[in-house]
């Protein structure tokens, strides 16, 4: 009927729509390396999954070019704050691309949670959420960084996480 | 032309893409029950809607299996804080499934907003946003909980809400 | 084969799925007008883009009716707080429609960040994120407002931004 090629494309697209790229990675004991590198993530256990995206050393890697809503939440907390900690904690999503030698800032938040302790208690908790749409080419990577990562609290993968899906 | 079955599927899919499951539920005076249960939500009035998802006693219920971006924001506020309140407020999204007897934590935040009052004023406001991709089977439910829910401020459905859409 | 019309629609839809409306606008030096109007945004440079949505005087404008996940983040910060500043900062997404004379609140957050300075430092940082699904008709607009906008910190488009995509 002359529609063969397009038909195959449509069939393929129907399948790929069911497989629209998406991922949700969760915090784990190994997430905080202390090495100055990005946070590392669980990709398979519990709530974590990869569908049409790859993972490599803390990075989500695009297999298909397009616009992605990327997001990350980190749970921050402590009893007081480390001496020498600036009054700012920075949580950001960064892109790695073969086209530039350095990581590119995508979405960034700065917070001053250490002043949040209630009277007579030095315990504080805070949470930082980032989300936004960015363009990724095939092979480009997105990572999460937190400075100072010592203040990230990990427990069970529900409080600190990292994900994306194509829009 | 031999494409009948697939054709019907495609036609169906076109319709269902227009009806990609999505919902946005808003806070209302009845949201806070004080019963220890999850928050309840407005499903029809104002900005609230359900499209391809059901609602039951505070829960969004999946009609179609797949990955969903689920989100919730709660507006917190008060003049000082209740005694006996730990310095933590917990805001979370939880899954109910016939496969487990207990709710499963999906996305959780902890915050210490009570220490945020400005000098001489005990008034404080804080907002907690959660969002992430989770897998839901048909009939599985997602609810929102806040501990201590007495600190959730409801007004007009714009400050505290709960939603989802399939990705 | 009697499927002509539907076939064309499907082909069209395949193309438009690739062009599912999406946008991400970034903060710039010109974002804060001090005029009492909404924040203005960069639409082309750096990470900013428009795909199937228009922009006009701070507003994202829908070209296609449907449900959109809209989001905004603003970076707040300062050294102390302006005298006369209420202990509340309001960050909101608002809809403009020909059907009403006034803007309609969609998603709103209130925060009290000025009390967040750490001991011995009056410097504070805070971030507010909003996101949720709303329905937009063709020509309806969404804008971002922050009261008091003097506390919004702009730098490079990564800390304060505004976006949307159809779900």
């Amino acid at each position: 009927d002359g529609h063969g090629g397009s038909w195959e494309q449509l069939i393929q697209e129907r399948r790929s729509h069911q497989n629209n790229p998406a991922a949700h990675l969760t915090g784990a004991n190994s997430s905080l390396t202390g090495s100055g590198g990005p946070l590392l993530w669980e990709t398979q256990l519990g709530l974590a999954f990869l569908r049409g995206l790859d993972y490599h050393d803390g990075a989500l890697v695009a297999n298909k070019a397009g616009y992605y809503y990327i997001y990350s939440k980190v749970q921050l907390g402590g009893v007081g704050c480390p001496l020498g900690l600036a009054s700012t904690i920075t949580h950001g999503l960064y892109k790695r691309t073969p086209r530039y030698p350095e990581e590119l800032e995508l979405l960034v938040s700065q917070q001053s949670p250490c002043g949040r302790a209630t009277s007579n208690s030095r315990v504080w908790w805070d949470s930082s959420f980032l989300g936004g749409v960015v363009h990724l080419e095939v092979g480009e990577e997105v990572v999460v960084r937190v400075l100072d990562e010592r203040l990230v609290r990990l427990r069970d993968g529900t409080r600190s996480y990292f994900g994306a899906f194509m829009v | 032309d031999g494409h009948g079955g697939s054709w019907e599927q495609l036609i169906q899919e076109r319709r269902s893409h227009q009806n990609n499951p999505a919902a946005h539920l808003t806070g209302a005076n009845s949201s806070l029950t004080g019963s220890g249960g999850p928050l309840l939500w407005e499903t029809q009035l104002g900005l609230a809607f359900l499209r391809g998802l059901d609602y039951h006693d505070g829960a969004l219920v999946a009609n179609k299996a797949g990955y969903y971006y689920i989100y919730s924001k709660v507006q917190l506020g008060g003049v000082g804080c209740p005694l006996g309140l730990a310095s933590t407020i917990t805001h979370g999204l939880y899954k109910r499934t016939p496969r487990y007897p207990e709710e499963l934590e999906l996305l959780v935040s902890q915050q210490s907003p009570c220490g945020r009052a400005t000098s001489n004023s005990r008034v404080w406001w804080d907002s907690s946003f959660l969002g992430g991709v989770v897998h839901l089977e048909v009939g599985e439910e997602v609810v929102v909980r806040v501990l201590d829910e007495r600190l959730v401020r409801l007004r007009d459905g714009t400050r505290s809400y709960f939603g989802a859409f399939m990705v | 084969d009697g499927h002509g019309g539907s076939w064309e629609q499907l082909i069209q839809e395949r193309r438009s799925h690739q062009n599912n409306p999406a946008a991400h606008l970034t903060g710039a030096n010109s974002s804060l007008t001090g005029s009492g109007g909404p924040l203005l945004w960069e639409t082309q440079l750096g990470l900013a883009f428009l795909r199937g949505l228009d922009y006009h005087d701070g507003a994202l404008v829908a070209n296609k009716a449907g449900y959109y996940y809209i989001y905004s983040k603003v970076q707040l910060g300062g050294v102390g707080c302006p005298l006369g500043l209420a202990s509340t900062i309001t960050h909101g997404l608002y809809k403009r429609t020909p059907r009403y004379p006034e803007e309609l609140e969609l998603l709103v957050s209130q925060q009290s960040p000025c009390g967040r300075a750490t001991s011995n430092s009056r410097v504070w940082w805070d971030s507010s994120f909003l996101g949720g699904v709303v329905h937009l008709e063709v020509g309806e607009e969404v804008v971002v407002r922050v009261l008091d906008e003097r506390l919004v910190r702009l730098r490079d488009g990564t800390r304060s931004y505004f976006g949307a995509f159809m779900v």
Epitope: S121 | R122, R155 | -
Partner: antibody, heavy 119, light 111 residues
């Protein structure tokens, strides 16, 4: 019955200190903040400060920050206020009162302790 | 500090009539629709007694002849019908900002 029982009247010399007590009964001590209020003869009421009985955290009226010290003994459900460097301006009746979130009203008051500063 | 100005300083009301006491705050005591204004009654030689919390809510055990209203900066306490035992000094108090402050008091005398 909910009660706040305050210690008896005090006659003290200028420059001295005095410690007043307020014993709570009929409710769980740790679930209400304790407040102290001053009333000079024939005058109005002044809020001195509060103490959180769970952790000893205090908030003061700036005017009384160097004058008053608030403490609690959870084991005996008793709150204390020590007043130091007393002058004739400190001669007053001092009340303890309990209150709580969300509206911070003082719903139960002690009978008051009269403090007279005189040489 | 938030200054609470009560008026009148004193008033005399006949038995069975209405007593109205005003309390004006130097700034709003509203938070998200709740008003952090409380009213107390004090009789000579006794501690104050809570009558009204959050601008208009009657404390438990307080007779219904006491009522109060207001929002923002202007508040009113009403007693109707006035009884003999209502002779006392009445104070308003704000609890939204430190230091918590009291009005100067209004002395009610029964004629």
């Amino acid at each position: 019955e909910v009660q706040l029982q305050q210690s008896g009247a005090e006659l003290v010399k200028p420059g001295a200190s005095v410690k007043l007590s307020c014993k709570a009964s009929g409710y769980t001590f740790a679930t209400y903040y304790m407040y102290w209020v001053k009333q000079r003869p024939g005058q109005g009421l002044e809020w001195i400060g509060e103490i959180n009985p769970t952790n000893g955290g205090t908030i003061f009226n700036e005017k009384f920050k160097t004058k008053a010290t608030l403490t609690v003994d959870k084991s005996s459900s008793t709150a204390y206020m020590q007043l130091s460097s007393l002058t004739s301006e400190d001669s007053a009746v001092y009340y303890c009162a309990r209150g709580n979130w969300p509206y911070w009203s003082f719903d139960v008051w002690g009978a008051g302790t009269s403090v007279t500063v005189s040489s | 500090d938030i200054v609470l100005t009560q008026s009148p300083a004193s008033l005399a009301v006949s038995l069975g009539q209405r007593a109205t006491i005003s309390c004006k705050a130097s700034q709003s005591v509203d938070f998200d629709g709740d008003n952090y204004m409380n009213w107390y009654q004090q009789k000579p030689g006794q501690p104050p007694k809570l009558l009204i919390y959050a601008a208009s809510n009657l404390d438990s055990g307080i007779p219904a002849r006491f009522s109060a209203s207001g929002s923002g900066t202007d508040f009113t306490l009403n007693i109707h019908p006035v009884e003999e035992e209502d002779a006392a000094t009445y104070y308003c108090q704000q609890s939204i900002e430190d230091p918590w402050t009291f009005g100067g008091g209004t002395k009610l005398e029964i004629k």
